[in-house]
């Protein structure tokens, strides 16, 4: 049998930001899986603090319930059942309340 | 129609400054922004992305720290500062409007961007 490696990185990640201060989360798939399996995951952090850690078999994540006035890191990257792959990492802030006039 | 002109690339050493920017025309610039570029060689990438106030902003790994992305309403215009530039900076850097129908706030996502700039080159040497 032929032994599995890491994946590659998840590529094209894009965060969304909706009007209700939720995320949405997409990325493509790696080009090399080198494994048996496929799951996606996401890790939201503020600050050095995990907020959010989610796991999908499809790479398209809806982040709920964020807070104003925070820095927020994300990280999505893939596992091939034996292996995590390099994360790809973005970083949103929000500085301001959403009104209306902004929508 | 929203036309979008940059400015301010060239040949800069590496650690140094360069402040790019984005002008806007015929059109309203009531719209999410963002900044990409691209490497010979390689894909389009994310740089930084602003809404339409100014008060929330995303940025890739790769610049966090070191670009800073901000808008002038009153001017039309889009900046990017960038600080401590590396010889990977090195591209063609894009700027971008987002598309009316876009639902977003704020986006990474290119294909949520209908109007884009000619590019500026900027070059970093060691």
């Known amino acids: 049998t032929t032994k599995s490696a890491p994946p590659s990185q998840v590529w094209n990640m894009t965060v969304s930001m909706t009007s209700d201060n939720s995320m949405h989360v997409k990325c493509r798939p790696p080009r090399d899986r080198n494994g048996p399996h496929e799951r996606y995951h996401l890790e939201v952090e503020a600050g050095n603090t995990l907020v959010r850690n989610e796991s999908h078999k499809n790479c398209d994540f809806r982040v709920k319930d964020l807070q104003y006035s925070t820095d927020y890191t994300f990280k999505a990257y893939f596992h091939n059942g034996d292996y995590p792959g390099e994360p790809f990492i973005l970083h949103h802030s929000e500085q301001k309340l959403i009104s209306e006039e902004d929508l | 129609q929203v036309q979008l002109q940059e400015f301010g690339g060239g040949l800069v050493q590496a650690g140094a400054s360069l402040r790019l920017s984005c002008a806007a025309s015929g059109g309203t610039f009531s719209y999410f922004m963002g900044w990409f570029r691209q490497a010979p060689g390689k894909e389009r990438e994310f740089v930084a992305t602003?809404?339409?106030?100014?008060?929330?902003?995303g940025y890739a790994d790769s610049v966090k720290g070191r670009f800073t992305i901000s808008r002038d309403n009153a001017k039309n215009t889009l900046y990017l500062q960038m600080d401590s530039v590396t010889p990977e900076d090195t591209a063609v850097y894009y700027c971008a409007a987002a598309r009316e129908s876009s639902v977003y706030y704020t986006s990474t996502d290119p294909a949520e961007y209908g109007y884009w700039g000619q590019g500026t080159q900027v070059t970093v040497s060691s």
């Open positions: 602003i809404n339409r106030n100014g008060g929330a902003t």
